[in-house]
């Protein structure tokens, strides 16, 4: 699910279609303020079809999406901006299969930022597209409070201080 100007969109088989269950308004939040919208142009452009999706060099392809694993380290907020500037977003994990793919491609055992942070506005862990985490699929170890952001390590999700510096994963 992707947030665009005034309506939440789904990328399905390369085309963007209005999602009936959500008419969203607004842009994405980072803990210290507001960032610009992720537009459907940015995020849907690359998905013509699951089979024909082309990933840029240095990006890995999986299930019709493209993934980029950083080598340097940044805070969650800086990582968030880095992905946006490259027409992508911090990793949103949809299921355990995707988690397994990510873990297989992580070449180290340290924490890695993903696109999930705690917002005290709604008192929930929220993915960068505005959707809440599915607690039936994922459990977050650690405190749920303001300035908490999520990092993965060995297929588990941990709550960490957003100002900590870790590697990160971008996705489109």
């Amino acid at each position: 699910l992707l947030v665009s100007q005034g309506v939440l969109l789904k990328c399905q088989k390369g085309s963007c279609s209005n999602a009936t269950q959500y008419e969203d308004t607004g842009d994405l939040k980072v803990n210290n303020g507001t960032r610009r919208n992720i537009s459907n142009k940015d995020l849907c452009a690359s998905r013509s079809a699951d089979q024909t999706v082309l990933c840029q060099s240095e990006w890995l392809k999986y299930q019709g999406k493209c993934y980029w694993f950083s080598n340097e380290m940044k805070s969650w907020s800086d990582s968030y901006v880095y992905c946006l500037e490259r027409k992508s977003h911090l990793l949103i994990i949809h299921d355990q299969l995707e988690m397994a793919f990510i873990q297989k491609n992580l070449r180290q055992l340290n924490y890695v930022w993903i696109g999930l942070n705690f917002t005290s506005l709604k008192m929930t862990w929220t993915w960068v597209d505005g959707s809440p985490i599915d607690s039936k699929i994922f459990f977050i170890k650690g405190p749920a409070k303001e300035n908490s952001c999520a990092a993965i390590k060995e297929s588990k999700i941990f709550s960490e201080t957003c100002s900590s510096v870790f590697k990160w994963i971008c996705q489109y």
């Epitope: 947030v3 939440l8 009936t20 269950q21 959500y22 008419e23 969203d24 308004t25 607004g26 842009d27 994405l28 939040k29 303020g33 507001t34 005290s120 506005l121 709604k122 008192m123 929930t124 929220t126 597209d129 505005g130 959707s131 809440p132 607690s135 303001e146």
Partner: antibody
Framework: SLEESGGRLVTPGGSLTLTCTVS????????MNWVRQAPGKGLEWIGA?????VAYYASWAKGRFTISRTSTTVDLKMTSLTTEDTATYFC????????????WGQGTLVTV | QIVVTQTPASVSAAVGGTVTISCQSS????????LSWYQQKPGQPPKLLIY???TLASGVPSRFKGSGSGTQFTLTISGVQCDDAATYYC??????????FGGGTEVVLV
């Protein structure tokens, strides 16, 4: 869409449960608010329930009001009702990334 | 207890004129911009006009403009039209899942 029900005439000291029935919306990912409006008065936030199902209340509403939800409804239980509670009660859904309510029900009238 | 104060309580306006409504919160809204404006007409639920302090909701005419940050916010209606006769409310969103409405401003056309 959202539709409130359960509003009726009730005697002081009584209890009442209002229901907000949701259709076409994934309630599990929604932040849902209850707001009331006394006749000729302004809007007053009562409380809300977030996606994990945790409820939050205005300081004046704590104790007497309880918000809960199922997969398709959001309930507002009110106890120890007084004449001051006479109002139209609205349920409203917030947009995903803001506290702005972009979907409202038509309201249900409670008369104490 | 968060208090949101709206002024004035009522304002008269001529068609084509400008209306300014102020909204003050007793504490900072979330992210300094989590402030919404609604329009309500008798017998109807409120309608979202502006969110995040200054972003126009879908389908809302550009004559409505929101501004402000932190605790002080303003709604300006430029080139007022007959259809704008209504009561306007601001609403703040706060940490801890809290929300609060202003007392409302009635816009009367003369």
């Amino acid at each position: 869409s959202l539709e409130e029900s359960g509003g009726r005439l009730v005697t002081p000291g009584g209890s009442l449960t209002l229901t907000c029935t949701v259709s076409g919306i994934d309630l599990s990912s929604a932040y849902m608010n209850w707001v009331r409006q006394a006749p000729g008065k302004g809007l007053e936030w009562i409380g809300a329930i977030n996606s994990p199902g945790v409820a939050y209340y205005a300081s004046w509403a704590k104790g007497r009001f309880t918000i809960s939800r199922t997969s398709t409804t959001v309930d507002l239980k009110m106890t120890s009702l007084t004449t001051e509670d006479t109002a139209t009660y609205f349920c409203a859904r917030e947009a995903a990334t803001t506290s702005a309510n972009n979907l409202w029900g038509q309201g249900t009238l409670v008369t104490v | 207890q968060i208090v949101v104060t709206q002024t004035p309580a009522s304002v008269s306006a001529a068609v084509g004129g400008t209306v300014t409504i102020s909204c003050q919160s007793s504490q900072n809204v979330y992210g300094n911009n989590e402030l919404s404006w609604y329009q309500q007409k008798p017998g109807q639920p409120p309608k979202l006009l502006i969110y995040k302090a200054s972003t126009l909701a879908s389908g809302v005419p550009s004559r409505f403009k929101g501004s402000g940050s932190g605790t002080q916010f303003t709604l300006t209606i430029s080139g007022v039209q007959c259809d704008d006769a209504a009561t306007y409310y601001c609403q703040g969103g706060y940490s801890g899942g809290m929300r609060s409405f202003g007392g409302g401003t009635e816009v009367v056309l003369v």
